[in-house]
Amino acid sequence: QRFAQAQQQLPLESLGWDVAELQLNHTGPQQDPRLYWQGGPALGRSFLHGPELDKGQLRIHRDGIYMVHIQVTLAICSSTTASRHHPTTLAVGICSPASRSISLLRLSFHQGCTIASQRLTPLARGDTLCTNLTGTLLPSRNTDETFFGVQWVRP
Amino acid sequence: QRFAQAQQQLPLESLGWDVAELQLNHTGPQQDPRLYWQGGPALGRSFLHGPELDKGQLRIHRDGIYMVHIQVTLAICSSTTASRHHPTTLAVGICSPASRSISLLRLSFHQGCTIASQRLTPLARGDTLCTNLTGTLLPSRNTDETFFGVQWVRP
Amino acid sequence: QRFAQAQQQLPLESLGWDVAELQLNHTGPQQDPRLYWQGGPALGRSFLHGPELDKGQLRIHRDGIYMVHIQVTLAICSSTTASRHHPTTLAVGICSPASRSISLLRLSFHQGCTIASQRLTPLARGDTLCTNLTGTLLPSRNTDETFFGVQWVRP
C-alpha cells in the first residue's frame, strides 16, 4: 500500500509516461507539404504531456521507444476522387535534427480516403517529427478523422 | 530484488493497467446502429481487466488516457460491394453520460472491406464507448477480423 | 527520488517491458506464405528487447497481454493491380506450438496497396507468431512501408 502511495506521489514525468495526441491545425503554404498540428485541453481532446510543439511540429523530450500513430482523412473525398488524385501519400518522419532525418511511416491513399497506421520506433530528445502530405487534396480537420500521437513505451 | 517482489504483490489494478479486447457479439435492431460486444476467456482471446460491459457497450472504470483501437471487416464483401454501399461508416465515441457525448474516431469504408485505426484519448470512470456502424452491410463476427479494445496508458 | 533510482537500477526485463519492431527480410519459397523478418540496430530502426527471432519468425519470451501491430505495403502496386490480384490477404497468428495455433489478425487488400492494423492479445512464452501473405504480389521491403511489432502491455 505504501508503494502504491509512493508511486502516486512521484511526478509522472519521472516514470517516463510521455504522451501526446494532436489535432490538425492547418496545412502549410504551397511548397510545404507538412501538416501543422495543435494540442491542448482548450482545443478538445488533444494534449501534450512531455513532448512539445515547435511551429506545429512535434518535438520529443525524452529518449525511448515510442508508439507513433496517425490517422488522416481527406476532405470531401470519395473513392473516385482519391483514385483520380493518386498518388496522395502521407509520410511521418524525423525531420530535425537533419543528421537524424528519416522516414518512419509511409502510406498512400490509392482508392481510399483515410489512412491509419502505427509503429514502434526509437526517438531521442530533440527529435522533431514531421508529417508530410503530398498531393492536391486537403486533409479533414475534424478531430475524429485526422489526428497524430505518440506514446512513450520504454527506455 | 525486494522492489520487484513488492511490485508483483500489488494488485495490477493499483498500477492502473486497465485493458480490454472485445469480439463482436451481434448488431443492434434495425434503428440501432450500435455494435454489441462480448469478452471473456470462455469466448476465446477476448478479455476485460478493469473495464466492464454494459449491455454490450464498453464502460470505463478508471480515469486516464487510453489507447482505443478497432478493426471492423464487412461480411461477404468485395471492393464492388463496398463502393456500391457507400457510405458505410464506423464511428467510435463516448455515448454516455450524455454530457460527455463525443465522436472519438470515424472512418468510412469507401472501396475497402476493412477499417482499422487507433487513437489516444482521455476517458473518465463511467464513460461508455459506443461503436456505430451505419450502412446496409453486416460486420464479420470472425474474431480475427472484427475486434475493439482499450488500453490504459497513463493518468 | 530513491524510488526513481531503484526503478532505474532494475533490469527493464523485470518490469516486463518486452518489445520488438521488425523489418521485412524476405518472403518464403513458393509454397511458404510466411514473411521472414529481421531486427536489430545494425539494420536501422528495428529492434528486439525480450522477444527473439527464430528462422525469421517472432518468438515470445514473456507471458502477458501484448499489443501486436503490423503494416504491409505491396510492391509496385496500384489500386488496379491490387484488385486484379484479389484476394491478397495478410494473416498474423500463433503458428507454434501447434496446440496454440490460431489466427489473431486478418486483412485483405481489396483495392488498396497497404494494410495496417493492431490488436491486444494474450501471448505465452514460446508462442511463435507468423505473418502469412497469400497472393501473387510481393511485399515492399522499405522499412517505412512494411513492419511488424509487439509490445508487452500487462501480465
Epitope: - | Q30, S140, R141 | -
Partner: antibody, heavy 120, light 111 residues
Framework: EVQLVQSGAEVKKPGSSVKVSCKAS????????MHWVRQAPGQGLEWMGA????????SYNQNFKGRVTLTADKSTSTAYMELSSLRSEDTAVYYC?????????????WGQGTLVTVSS | DIVMTQSPDSLAVSLGERATINCRAS??????????MHWYQQKPGQPPKLLIS???NLESGVPDRFSGSGSGTDFTLTISSLQAEDVAVYYC?????????FGQGTKLEIK
C-alpha cells in the same frame, strides 16, 4: 414499412417478351438490391437476378442465358424485369423482393406477384 | 451453384406437436461468423414470408414457436407446437454467394 407493388397479369405468345414493373414505396430504393424470383405453377422458387438501383449494376442467374434484363428508374422508384424469347415453361408468377435492412440476398419484402402466362 | 436439399418433401404433424424440417447445402453457407441460411413460409396464392434469417434469427412478428438452428451445411427449422395456421409450404434459401438458391420446399399438413 416498404411496399412493393407489381404490375398486373400478362398473357404472352411464345417467342415474345414481357416486361414486369415493381414500384417501391419509401426513399431507400437506390440503396438496396432489388431481386426477382419466379415460381412456376406448383413448383419451387427460382432466383432470376438482381439490380442495384443506385448504380444500375446487375447480377443474373446464368440459367436464363441472357434472356432476362433488369433495369431501374430511380426517379419513380420502379424496377423492371424483362424476359425475352418466351416459351411455355416461362409460365410462372414473377416476384420482386428485397431485404429490409441489410443488403444481402434474403428477402423481407415481396411484391404481390405477377402471373405471366405463355400460351399460343 | 449451391444445391439446397430439403427433407422431407411433405410432413404431417398433429396439432400441438413438434414439426421439424431439415435442409442440407451442397457446400458450407457459413462465412464471417454467420450462417447465410434463411427460412420462408408460403401459403397458397401469397408470396413467401421470411420467418428466420441467418439460420437462427427470428424475424419481427413471427411467433416464437418457430426456431432455426444449424451451421455449415446442415440446418433445421422447428415449429415447437404446430398450430392450424402453420399449414403451408416451407422453403430454405442460402445467400452465401450468387446465385442464391432455394430448397425444393416441404409441404406441412395437419395429421
Amino acid at each position: 414499412e416498404v411496399q412493393l407493388v407489381q404490375s398486373g397479369a400478362e398473357v404472352k405468345k411464345p417467342g415474345s417478351s414481357v416486361k414486369v414493373s415493381c414500384k417501391a414505396s419509401g426513399d431507400t430504393f437506390p440503396r438496396y438490391n432489388m431481386h426477382w424470383v419466379r415460381q412456376a405453377p406448383g413448383q419451387g422458387l427460382e432466383w432470376m437476378g438482381a439490380i442495384f438501383p443506385g448504380t444500375g449494376e446487375t447480377s443474373y442467374n446464368q440459367n436464363f442465358k441472357g434472356r432476362v434484363t433488369l433495369t431501374a428508374d430511380k426517379s419513380t422508384s420502379t424496377a423492371y424485369m424483362e424476359l425475352s424469347s418466351l416459351r411455355s415453361e416461362d409460365t410462372a408468377v414473377y416476384y420482386c423482393a428485397r431485404n429490409s435492412y441489410y443488403d444481402y440476398a434474403w428477402f423481407t419484402y415481396w411484391g404481390q406477384g405477377t402471373l405471366v402466362t405463355v400460351s399460343s | 451453384d449451391i444445391v439446397m436439399t430439403q427433407s422431407p418433401d411433405s410432413l404431417a404433424v398433429s396439432l400441438g406437436e413438434r414439426a421439424t424440417i431439415n435442409c442440407r447445402a451442397s457446400k458450407s453457407v457459413s462465412s464471417s461468423g454467420y450462417s447465410f441460411m434463411h427460412w420462408y413460409q408460403q401459403k397458397p396464392g401469397q408470396p413467401p414470408k421470411l420467418l428466420i434469417s441467418l439460420a437462427d434469427n427470428l424475424e419481427s412478428g413471427v411467433p416464437d414457436r418457430f426456431s432455426g438452428s444449424g451451421s455449415g451445411t446442415d440446418f433445421t427449422l422447428t415449429i415447437s407446437s404446430l398450430q392450424a395456421e402453420d399449414v403451408a409450404v416451407y422453403y430454405c434459401q442460402h445467400s452465401r454467394e450468387f446465385p442464391p438458391t432455394f430448397g425444393q420446399g416441404t409441404k406441412l399438413e395437419i395429421k
